[in-house]
């Protein structure tokens, strides 16, 4: 996501499964830390936002034609799993240790 | 990058190496098709934007708390190489068939 003046970084985002309607099949946890990628991808792109060549090119083009081309975007570049207790196809409480791609591990400019 | 009302998609972006100051070391091509990912990541996220679970979660949270949490972002999810003729460290024109990560192959919501 883009953010006003701050640099692309990982910020807290507590997600309650009831808020998103997933409590119908996820029994536990009730909420979890998803994190969110927030902030801008400003020139020059620092190493910590692990920019791709395309992101660097787009940033340079945006610098020259800001109204024509957008900035690169601050997004999750690495995700982590969480453990969940969910209802299987038969409704039986079942444990999945690694429910992949649910929490941000790293953010970057893409 | 985000876009007004349109759905996340790959759009044309012709990049002239002179515009970004890379003509000092890239001899050819003079310009290339970099493409750009443009458009919004709106609910519900379609399969063609290959959303991660985190992107789906963030989209649902944004739906409930639009001022607190941003939408997922439309970014390159797969990049392609281009071929370039460049000046090596000694200024000798050298061909690189696969200069990786320069052109968007696919866009998605992240």
């Amino acid at each position: 996501s883009t953010g006003a003046g701050s640099h692309c970084q990982k910020t807290s985002l507590r997600v309650n499964f009831e808020d998103i309607g997933w409590n119908s099949w996820i029994i536990a946890p009730k909420e979890y830390e998803a994190y969110e990628c927030k902030g801008g991808c400003f020139f020059p792109l620092a190493d910590d936002v692990t920019p791709t060549k395309h992101a660097i090119v787009q940033t340079l083009v945006h610098l020259k034609f800001p109204t024509k081309v957008g900035k690169a975007c601050c997004v999750p570049t690495k995700l982590s799993p969480i453990s969940i207790l969910y209802k299987d196809d038969m409704g039986v409480p079942t444990l999945k240790y690694h429910y992949e791609g649910m929490s941000v591990a790293e953010c970057g400019c893409r | 990058s985000t876009g007004a009302g349109s759905h996340c998609q790959k759009t044309s972006l012709r990049v002239n190496f002179e515009d970004i100051g890379w003509n000092s070391w890239i001899i050819a091509p003079k310009e290339y098709e970099a493409y750009e990912c443009k458009g919004g990541c709106f609910f519900p996220l379609a399969d063609d934007v290959t959303p991660t679970k985190h992107a789906i979660v963030q989209t649902l949270v944004h739906l409930k708390f639009p001022t607190k949490v941003g939408k997922a972002c439309c970014v390159p999810t797969k990049l392609s190489p281009i071929s370039i003729l460049y000046k090596d460290d000694m200024g000798v024109p050298t061909l690189k068939y696969h200069y990786e990560g320069m052109s968007v192959a696919e866009c998605g919501c992240r």
Partner: antibody
Framework: QVQLVQSGAEVKKPGSSVKVSCKAS????????IHWVRQAPGQGLEWMGG????????YYAQKFQGRVTITADESTSTAYMELSSLRSEDTAVYYC???????????????????WGQGTLVTVSS | QSVLTQPPSVSGAPGQRVTISCSGS????????VYWYQQLPGTAPKLLIY???NRPSGVPDRFSGSKSGTSASLAITGLQAEDEADYYC???????????FGGGTKLTVLG
């Protein structure tokens, strides 16, 4: 080889509470759900409830809701079943049984109670 | 009264074949797996059949399970004296969100 060892027999007065323990050895405790099933003298098996220690999430048969509390201590691989407001009809053998909850195990086996504890006789008498 | 219905007793002579039935509904047997437990006199129940028709290691192939619609059955062939026990069927009830058992069937081996 997983083994479940339960605490000894108890004699209780009506209106009191009883707490039965079930200690697991072998296997990974966080992979289990521990369920409690009782059997009144000469009667069949009756499921009371179960707990998934990994999250501490318990669920109960409606008949026992509010009167039974199932807990677990992961550090000692022990599950507990506490039944309050005891009456003479609660006289029974109480069994704990393991169910594998990890979805890395085939669903057919994941829903089985295996193994069982040796049972704990709880007698409610004035 | 048990949610799953079993005959209270069955009997057979050594070497014979007996079957024990277990009747339920669409929310338990009809939509879920069936399990069978053997309880020898004075001992805890032991898993005999899991997932309708699978035998855990150590259970003789004389024991077999089957399921059709909202009913299940346990078949024992070549009856032996040591098979004398109580047998319970069991399934998850999707609607009630509970594990349900049959009332149990006492198997007597004659002679």
């Amino acid at each position: 080889q997983v083994q479940l060892v339960q605490s000894g027999a108890e004699v209780k007065k009506p209106g009191s509470s009883v707490k039965v323990s079930c200690k697991a050895s072998g296997g990974t405790f966080s992979d289990y759900a521990i369920h409690w099933v009782r059997q009144a003298p000469g009667q069949g098996l009756e499921w009371m409830g179960g707990i998934i220690p990994f999250f501490g999430t318990a669920y109960y048969a409606q008949k026992f809701q509010g009167r039974v509390t199932i807990t677990a201590d992961e550090s000692t691989s022990t599950a507990y079943m506490e039944l309050s407001s005891l009456r003479s009809e609660d006289t029974a053998v109480y069994y704990c049984a393991r169910r594998i909850v990890s979805d890395s195990v085939a669903v057919q086996y994941r829903h089985a109670f295996d193994p069982w504890g040796q049972g704990t006789l709880v007698t409610v008498s004035s | 009264q048990s949610v799953l219905t079993q005959p209270p007793s069955v009997s057979g002579a050594p070497g014979q074949r007996v079957t024990i039935s277990c009747s339920g509904s669409s929310s338990n047997i009809g939509s879920n797996y069936v399990y069978w437990y053997q309880q020898l006199p004075g001992t805890a129940p032991k898993l005999l059949i899991y997932g309708n028709n699978n035998r855990p290691s150590g259970v003789p192939d004389r024991f077999s399970g089957s399921k059709s619609g909202t009913s299940a059955s346990l078949a024992i062939t070549g009856l032996q004296a040591e098979d004398e026990a109580d047998y319970y069927c069991n399934a998850w009830d999707t609607k009630a969100y509970v594990w349900v058992f049959g009332g149990g069937t006492k198997l007597t081996v004659l002679g």
